[in-house]
Interface confidence: low
Amino acid sequence: SGEIALCKTGFPEDVYSAVLSKDVHEGQPLLNVKFSNCNGKRKVQYESSEPADFKVDEDGMVYAVRSFPLSSEHAKFLIYAQDKETQEKWQVAVKLSLKPTLTEESVKESAEVEEIVFPRQFSKHSGHLQRQKRDWVIPPINLPENSRGPFPQELVRIRSDRDKNLSLRYSVTGPGADQPPTGIFIINPISGQLSVTKPLDREQIARFHLRAHAVDINGNQVENPIDIVINVIDMNDNRPEFLHQVWNGTVPEGSKPGTYVMTVTAIDADDPNALNGMLRYRIVSQAPSTPSPNMFTINNETGDIITVAAGLDREKVQQYTLIIQATDMEGNPTYGLSNTATAVITVTDVNDNPPEFTAMTFYGEVPENRVDIIVANLTVTDKDQPHTPAWNAVYRISGGDPTGRFAIQTDPNSNDGLVTVVKPIDFETNRMFVLTVAAENQVPLAKGIQHPPQSTATVSVTVIDVNENPYFAPNPKIIRQEEGLHAGTMLTTFTAQDPDRYMQQNIRYTKLSDPANWLKIDPVNGQITTIAVLDRESPNVKNNIYNATFLASDNGIPPMSGTGTLQIYLLDINDNAPQVLPQEAETCETPDPNSINITALDYDIDPNAGPFAFDLPLSPVTIKRNWTITRLNGDFAQLNLKIKFLEAGIYEVPIIITDSGNPPKSNISILRVKVCQCDSNGDCTDVDRIVGAGLGTGA
């Protein structure tokens, strides 16, 4: 109503009304009773006639002091306003009414009677009365989801008390009206009747916030917009849904009752704060039902599955299948909606079964001297999960093998123990081994499980006699012998031993290598005799040692043989005369500027070699006439021309060289001397002419 009136201090209404839900909560704002203060300087203080239930703040907002269910005793109370300076008092009545219960019929009924009026307030401004927005808590409209109609379904009527004077048009704005999803809420522009056009789904939109507008026929706003909140009330229209249809969990065998296994989870699209969305879980069935039909329990609120009975044994039951049910309405079987899922619980292996040998004694045989061969196959059984550390066998030899001749490897596929020989065995020393072997797993046995006697076995290993190689001892055999021995001299006896003491075989000897063919061996007794003269200076002798190898063969099946080396250390005798070195030399036709240095080559060694004596023979006389020899030291001498000139040519100069042996050995060696024309440096200039000149005799 836009009429002009003088400002009147006090409450503008005689009675204030508010429509509330049955449950009023502590601190809940109920309505606003703001005082019309024409003289803006007044300071007003508010008070409630029911201070235990209601209080009013300095802005006139009424709040509930405590939580209580709304009943007729709270239906009416008074609010007092008092001027703090003049002590002048005013009062107004407040009427509280209960919102009707939410059946579709009651919603419909309330829609027919309920009316929301644009609130009014007057204040003096510039001498005129002016309309102002007043704070007003409009209770929300509660509307159940999935209503069956008929539609449109009337909710409330929006009106302005200015419709007495003016022709007004009403509209609503906001999501659900003119914004997506559009057209859910409509308003009759003339009557202000607000209606819903279709069923609502709380799970899509749980709350609508609309604004109602009133304008005159020219489109001018005559009221401030008011907020309308529509709460969609939940119905139990959604079943619980498990996040997975099949849930997989594990639990170790032998677990104590109370062991956590897994958690299953279902969700319900309905309101989680209402019974419609409050779920409870239960186990419907367990398969298999051994050793007890109730091996597991489920926390009905959290979905945690735990063991509840002892006796989980993977070797008996490897997997349990539980059917789990989730029911809303806190699990009420009558009203609640349910769904099921499967929990598959795998019982995991622990090492609660030791490996057990399939026999108390295993037998094997091994040829002597062989290594890296499999002697015996040890077999075990283990009820734990194959090819896991609780099943994989580890074998050890606990007795009967003090020198570590055997080892046991595990065949990864069969789990068998492969007993192998790692050090050669001599039949003549050990004919049999009785090994004590133990089988364990790669991981320790579970607590409280002991190794039974069947985890230990014996392995009886028979050593097979093999025809072994005869061997010479010592090998090599070293003897010292003077060279020059005549053929037929017995040097030594070189015999071999046969390791096969029990076979009583004959050994025959043959020569294997004798580079100079100096020796023979007696095939029966191994006596070595010379068949030629031993020569220390032979190319077959290295560092005074002559090596010959011999073969000793037994008459076993198959025959075996061994080789032995005889090393003859040859002592030198003076059997080699020295020779001149070099055998060819060059000098000039005149004695200066050069001379020829010579030495001696003697294949013997000290004391049968140097120092040497060098001399020229008496015959032919031309030698001593033309040449002179001068001893430099025990090994070297110098040959020079004695005459002033000797024609270019090739001359053979005989030189007598004597060694220091006892008796000494002498030899006349020929030195070929090329005499040539020389340049100033003493180098030959006419080599070609000399070559053509032929030989002379040192003359």
Partner: antibody, heavy 119, light 107 residues
């Protein structure tokens, strides 16, 4: 020097038998195992079995156990391999080889004998 | 029986390049019993490497052999024209088997 000389090529019909020889020289015949290995055209090597003249011991690959027979004549240092009930997939070059002193390697090989099985 | 798997089946390389041939045993083989042979068309195989890493008589030192637990390798440091052939690995540890061969061919 060590030599293994094998007999000449053979052409046989399916179902027939073939006997191949391998003559050894240059070493003590009774001291070494003689192996037989075959190689089908364009294929790898397949072990048939071995014969030890020293003791007469024989070992066969399970695959050939029922069809192969290994024998020897020590007087002429020769090992024989007979394969019966021939099939077309027995067409191959058959080698004899000497096993070394230790470790099981084949240190000397024959030149091979081609056996063709065809109807 | 122990299965020997050789890889690759064919190795295409140029002279001067390095070649690595692999032989994997289905179960453990003692290194003393793993050998390699070279075979050229129309010829018998020839012992090349014995006991995993020992070169047979007359084999050039550009060849070498090595091993892991069940993996064995033949390596040619620098390929020469005469090295192009098929190489077989062979075990005598349990029964007796050969690998399928690796053909080293000129790229």
């Amino acid at each position: 020097q060590v030599q293994l000389v094998q007999s000449g090529a053979e052409v046989k019909k399916p179902g027939a038998s073939v006997k191949l020889s391998c003559k050894a020289s240059g070493f003590t015949f009774t001291d070494y195992l003689i192996q037989w290995v075959r190689q089908a055209p364009g294929q790898g090597l397949e072990w048939i079995g071995w014969f030890y003249p020293g003791s007469g011991s024989i070992k066969y690959n399970e695959k050939f156990k029922d069809r192969a027979t290994l024998t020897a004549d020590k007087s002429i240092n020769t090992v024989y391999m007979e394969l019966s009930r021939l099939r077309s997939d027995d067409t191959a070059v058959y080698f004899c080889a000497r096993r070394g002193d230790w470790g099981g390697f084949f240190d000397y090989w024959g030149q091979g004998t081609l056996v063709t099985v065809s109807s | 029986d122990i299965v020997l798997t050789q890889s690759p089946a064919t190795l295409s390389l140029s002279p001067g390049e390095r070649a690595t041939l692999s032989c994997t045993a289905s179960s453990s083989v003692s290194s003393s019993y793993l050998h390699w042979y070279q075979q050229k068309p129309g010829s018998a195989p020839r012992l090349w490497i014995f006991s995993t890493s020992n070169l047979a008589s007359g084999i050039p030192d550009r060849f070498s052999g090595g091993s892991g637990s069940t993996d064995y390798t033949l390596t040619i440091s620098r390929l020469e024209p005469e090295d192009f052939a098929v190489y077989y690995c062979h075990q005598y540890h349990r029964s007796l088997t050969f690998g399928g061969g690796t053909k080293v061919e000129i790229k």
